[in-house]
């Protein structure tokens, strides 16, 4: 799978994680930090 960094306009899209662009799927994706979930890593779970 080819990945690259998200465009600058997506800065802040992922609240607790890193935004990556999945080139083959044409999708931005939030890779969440440990303890966070959700489309934008907005939910904390214990």
């Amino acid at each position: 799978v080819s990945i690259t960094k998200c465009n600058s306009d997506m800065n802040g899209y992922c609240l607790h994680g890193q935004c990556i662009y999945l080139v083959d799927m044409s999708q931005n994706y939030c890779r969440c930090e440990v303890g966070y979930t959700g489309v934008r890593c907005e939910h904390f779970y214990l």
Epitope: N7, S8, D9, G12, Y13, L15, Y21, V23, S26, Q27, N28, Y29, V39, R40, E42
Partner: antibody, heavy 116, light 106 residues
Framework: QDQLVQSGAEVKKPGASVKVSCKAS????????IQWVRQAPGQGLEWMGR????????KYREKFEGRVTITADTSTNTAYMELSSLRSEDTAVYYC?????????WGQGTLVTVSS | DIQMTQSPSSLSASVGDRVTITCKAS??????IAWYQQKPGQAPRLLIQ???TLQPGVPSRFSGSGSGTDYTFTISSLQPEDIATYYC????????FGGGTKVEIK
């Protein structure tokens, strides 16, 4: 399926304000950004600004700063664009556009006519 | 704001011709460019995103290329149904559309 349904056509007098709504269904606007783009008759496409409904953060094109306000109501899954101090040059079709995980998905457009 | 200079503003070509449109950005946009087709009275239709990724259902005669500040959109063999106005859009930093290219049949 995913939809962005915009409010109906408006006719306004110069100096007035207009507020266009954009109701999302099939997805949560908190997962997206909502952009606003306009197109005057016979003219090109012009980006106006956008909102991050989750953070309630906005970005506007410089030429619209102070005249446009983009808001979002996450309880009704609806975004709004209000443009004030209308002039004849603001006559255009206004589009809301979803961006975020996937690339742009457009509403059907709202015609705003400014005429005395 | 990033400026997008699109050329030509209009062109006339014959059916079967190869048509090329260019967009030049005022700074590096890291391949974050999309191309739209718009027919009169219709909303814009997304053809290509991320420089060269064709949208599902878009004919393979449409293609895109480029990097840095210089990008190209090509119709390899112009068809009558391709008569429309085409716009580039940079979405690396905020958003800026090119001025559009009106494509007509000669």
């Amino acid at each position: 399926q995913d939809q962005l349904v915009q409010s109906g056509a408006e006719v306004k007098k110069p100096g007035a304000s207009v507020k266009v709504s954009c109701k999302a269904s099939g997805f949560n606007i908190k997962d997206t950004y909502i952009q606003w783009v306009r197109q005057a008759p016979g003219q090109g496409l012009e980006w106006m600004g956008r909102i991050d409904p989750l953070r309630r953060q906005t970005k506007y094109r410089e030429k619209f700063e102070g005249r446009v306000t983009i808001t979002a109501d996450t309880s009704t899954n609806t975004a709004y664009m209000e443009l004030s101090s209308l002039r004849s040059e603001d006559t255009a079709v206004y589009y809301c556009v979803r961006s975020g995980r996937e690339f742009d998905f457009w509403g059907q457009g709202t015609l705003v006519t400014v005429s005395s | 704001d990033i400026q997008m200079t699109q050329s030509p503003s209009s062109l006339s070509a014959s059916v079967g011709d190869r048509v090329t449109i260019t967009c030049k950005a005022s700074q590096d946009i890291h391949k974050y460019i999309a191309w739209y087709q718009q027919k009169p009275g219709q909303a814009p239709r997304l053809l290509i995103q991320y420089t060269s990724t064709l949208q599902p259902g878009v004919p393979s005669r449409f293609s895109g290329s480029g990097s840095g500040t210089d990008y190209t959109f090509t119709i390899s063999s112009l068809q009558p149904e391709d008569i429309a106005t085409y716009y580039c859009l940079q979405y690396d930093n905020r958003r800026t559309f090119g001025g559009g290219t009106k494509v007509e049949i000669k």
